[in-house]
């Protein structure tokens, strides 16, 4: 066959669908690879062809569109399963071609099983809700296009394994689930089961997402430097190890980049000719507030090093702060035989 622009296996689109449920999969060519849509391609006389490679096989084979009850069908740029079976797992290819043009892309499709509590190997989207906030909603995802607007599906929501009914702080409202209050106890998986009729059959769509309750933006503050502080003096003798922790608290802020860094005499440690190492550790609270600790370490400090300025800096979307560490050279304790004896006038 003539040359075809092969975009390879699009592993960015790791599509997972539940067994025994409808699935509609759009050909990725029009979404990510080509600058025109299906309608334009179709008008230009291009044909969309589908084929697949079964799991653990190398042989590409055409998709059987003549199964009973049209279990697998194609509609425009969408491949339909009504419903999926476990052995539909494999790599699917959509190819757009005519006599002079050819472009194709493959993508993996995994049909997964779920248990009665909706546990499965499915990768779940995470939805963050704010603590101490007003009413917040999550929406049943990826159900568009499965049924026409004239069809009124029934939607049942679950928290983990529990059907959400008369909950104190969570109210199902069709495709939405409203949280009157979001508690840390609300962390976990929420599932909507959408049931709709089609051609005398009943289909179910199961969609699970993870809710994570995080700090509220109205409680967010600029970074707080707990250490260094004015109460601690780093007093060292030359040759000793100097260890200064910089500990910073960051309020949770959606999409904020939290940064901590040291300067020595106003320069980055890399730009100073001394042997400095910096180790960082990060911990998170239950609401994803963050505490970062950067420990500045000089193995054998010199008297010159003890005269330098050591400043810890922190920055988030809420602002930037800095705090200097108080570093001093320890005054050696007097040695009795010489200093004290001389002091007492001994000869």
């Amino acid at each position: 066959s003539e040359r075809c622009d092969d975009w390879g296996l699009d592993t960015m689109r790791q599509i997972q669908v539940f067994e025994d449920e409808p699935a509609r999969i759009k050909c990725p060519l029009f979404e990510h690879f080509l600058k025109f849509n299906y309608s334009t391609a179709h008008s230009a006389g291009l044909t969309l062809i589908w084929y697949w490679t079964r799991q653990d096989r190398d042989l590409e084979e055409p998709i059987n569109f003549r199964l009973p009850e049209n279990r697998i069908s194609k509609e425009k740029d969408v491949l339909w399963f009504r419903p999926t079976l476990l052995n539909d797992t494999g790599n699917y290819t959509c190819m757009l071609r005519n006599t002079t043009y050819c472009s194709k892309v493959a993508f993996p499709l995994e049909v997964v099983q779920k248990d009665s509590c909706f546990n499965s190997p499915m990768k779940l989207p995470v939805h963050k809700l704010y603590i101490e906030y007003g009413i917040q909603r999550i929406t049943c995802p990826n159900v568009d296009g499965y049924f026409p607007s004239s069809v009124k599906p029934t939607i049942t929501w679950y928290m983990g394994c529990y059907k959400i009914q008369n909950f104190n702080n969570v109210i199902p409202e069709g495709m939405n689930l409203s949280f009157l209050i979001a508690f840390i106890s609300n962390n976990g998986n929420y599932t909507c089961v959408v049931t709709y009729p089609e051609n005398g059959r009943t289909f179910h769509l199961t969609r699970t997402l993870t809710v994570k309750v995080v700090g509220s933006p109205k409680n967010a503050v600029p970074p707080v430097i707990h250490s260094p502080n004015d109460h601690v003096v780093y007093e060292k003798e030359p040759g000793e190890e100097l260890l200064i922790p910089c500990t910073v608290y960051f309020s949770f802020l959606m999409d904020s980049r939290n940064e901590v860094w040291w300067t020595i005499d106003g320069k980055k440690p890399d730009d100073i000719p001394i042997d400095v190492t910096i180790n960082e550790s990060i911990s998170h609270s239950r609401t994803e507030d963050e505490t970062r600790t950067q420990i500045l370490s000089i193995k054998k400090v010199t008297s010159e090093d003890l005269k330098r300025s050591y400043v810890c800096h922190a920055r988030s979307a809420k602002g930037e702060v800095a705090k200097a560490a108080t570093v001093k050279q320890k005054v050696p304790a007097p040695r009795y035989t010489v200093e004290l004896a001389c002091g007492f006038g001994a000869t």
Epitope: I131, E132, Y133, G134, I135, M159, G160, C161, Y162, Q165, N166, F167, N168, N169, L180, I181, F183, I184, S185, R286, T287
Partner: antibody, heavy 119, light 107 residues
């Protein structure tokens, strides 16, 4: 530390009205919601009503729905329970309690105020 | 409404005893359960939330466990100040409901 102090209890005739207050001292209410809980003499605790901190949505127990109204005045840091069409079975100590914002729990309680409905 | 059933209703024990109170919910409430202590003429005091988390300032001899429909409150070594009535409280389903109480009295 916030403290809650109830007032407004007393003796009232059946069919009468009473307004209970719950004032927060030492800070604002905070939390996710404010609740009223009652306890009839020698009996257990019974939840009566709540009002959400954000949005002000009110919820009631079936036994008081249509008769009791919960409200709050944030400027005065005070929670109210307006009780109308009182019945003998409403006789109880009424507590206000704060619902925590982190976890479902009533973490601060007032000392209670006694409401007696009797002719 | 969810029924919260505590057992026993009354419990006679001595200082130093290990005491266990059970609370059963008529339907699953996950871990949305709290325990309170109440002394005569006083307001309830929060001991345990989220079924097993100890409220700040509460002695570590108090502990909670359970999930779903079966929950327990345990006092590992009863102290004189622990003689009181204890209530479980479910906060998942509307309306909030409490157990009928368990009175811990001196044997």
């Amino acid at each position: 530390e916030v403290q809650l102090v109830e007032s407004g209890g007393g003796l009232v005739q059946p069919g009468g009205s009473l307004r209970l207050s719950c004032a927060a001292s030492g800070g604002t209410f905070g939390g996710s919601a404010m609740h009223w809980v009652r306890q009839a003499p020698g009996k257990g605790l019974v939840w009566v009503s709540r009002i959400l901190t954000y949005g002000g949505i009110a919820t009631y127990a079936e036994s008081v729905k249509g008769r009791f109204t919960i409200s709050r005045d944030n400027a005065k840091n005070t929670l109210y329970l307006q009780m109308n069409s009182l019945r003998a079975e409403d006789t109880a100590v009424y507590y206000c309690a704060r619902g925590s914002s982190e976890y479902p729990k009533f973490d601060i309680w007032g000392q209670g105020t006694l409401v007696t409905v009797s002719s | 409404d969810i029924q919260m059933t505590q057992s026993p209703s009354t419990l006679s024990a001595s200082v130093g005893d290990r005491v266990t109170i059970t609370c059963r919910a008529s339907q699953s409430i996950s871990s949305w359960l709290a325990w309170y202590q109440q002394k005569p003429g006083k307001a309830p005091k929060l001991l345990i939330y989220d079924a097993s988390s100890l409220e700040s300032g509460v002695p570590s001899r108090f502990s909670g466990s359970g999930s779903g429909t079966e929950f327990t409150l345990t006092i590992s070594s009863l102290q004189p100040e622990d003689f009181a009535t204890y209530y479980c409280h479910q906060l998942l389903i509307y309306p909030h409901t409490f157990g009928q109480g368990t009175k811990v009295e001196i044997k």
